[in-house]
């Protein structure tokens, strides 16, 4: 049997907050992989995306059934051996976010900026409110860039 750090690289162990716990593996170990040690427990076959083990696997090789994640609250997007699904992300309106695509059993929530908010980084954890211009707009605010304002005293063409 393999140690807890020797698992199939295609399989992700997942905790309850939607966080993947990645394990290291060598090619030789992967070829001989029969199951997975997880916290002293041994699983033979993973659950498919959208499901989790009904309980932790045991040392004696007892193989729990896979059960669905809670729709709209939890998900798993990879095959895994955990008894916990991943928690769906909340699009926190206090961080300027709203739901773009709802969470499903196999896909986490996708968030976007709320109207009149923008985010200019690749991964948006927080959106900022678009600037309101006092002296006119050069360029409207978009999801990825702030408003460009005219300066005081500048003439419009």
């Amino acid at each position: 049997r393999l140690s807890s750090k020797s698992v199939n690289a295609q399989v992700t162990d997942i905790n309850s907050k939607g966080l993947e716990l990645r394990k290291t593996v060598t090619t030789v170990e992967t070829q001989n992989l029969e199951g997975l040690h997880h916290d002293g427990q041994f699983c033979h076959k993973p659950c498919p995306p959208g499901e989790r083990k009904a309980r932790d696997c045991t040392v004696n090789g007892d193989e729990p059934d896979c059960v669905p994640c809670q729709e709209g609250k939890e998900y798993t997007d990879k095959a895994h051996f955990s008894s916990k699904c991943r928690r769906c992300r909340l699009c926190d309106e206090g961080h300027g976010l709203e739901v773009e695509i709802n969470c499903t059993r196999t896909q986490n929530t996708k968030c976007r900026c709320k109207p009149n908010f923008f985010c200019n980084s690749t991964v948006c954890e927080h959106c900022d409110p678009c600037t309101k211009c006092e002296h006119g707009i050069i360029k409207e605010c978009t999801l990825t860039s702030n408003t460009k304002c005219k300066e005081e005293g500048s003439r419009s063409n």
């Epitope: 309850s16 907050k17 939607g18 966080l19 993947e20 909340l90």
Partner: antibody
Amino acid sequence: QVQLVQSGAEVKKPGASVKVSCKASGYTFTSYWMQWVKQAPGQGLEWMGEIDPSDSYTNYNQKFKGKATITVDTSTSTAYMELSSLRSEDTAVYYCARNRDYSNNWYFDVWGQGTLVTVSS
Amino acid sequence: DIVLTQSPSSLSASVGDRVTITCKASQSVDYDGDSYMNWYQQKPGQAPKLLIYAASNLESGVPSRFSGSGSGTDFTLTISSLQPEDFATYYCQQSNEDPRTFGQGTKVEIK
């Protein structure tokens, strides 16, 4: 401003139940999950469970399953936490707290003032 | 459950001192480069107050003398110049895994 106001202190006999309320104001109640945290006298903080007010979905710390029941009344923007079969070890201050999410990191940004529940015969 | 151990359990310091509190997790609370650690301050008879979220983000309205750092299993809360109102108990809290857990607390007292 965002505020959570909890019900007053309670003294209960062993075996009884108690229901603590937490009234929210200053924000859209259904947009944020509500958390409950226990603090025994002179002790640290212990997470009990949470509720999504938009659909009443609950998630409990295994330790408090069967002991605590969390509910909401969206018409009054109030969350409730009921403790059953009270014992002396349930004597504690109970806090409600608003949940926030920063890229799946969940944290508690606004707290109620706490409700002291004393269990004594 | 993830166990968080804070050190020291208590410390005595003077106004103006730089104070460092550490929080060690029994397993990593990181994912994909993000750290799922939060810090709270609690004064006697009061509710906890959020200081830092996601390891290093300062909550709105919290003085900039408070800062958080760390990753994996080791995290630090630093108060750059201790003020009279900072004498309190500080808690770390992880949200990487259910049940969410808190450290046992660090009491900062006046020297």
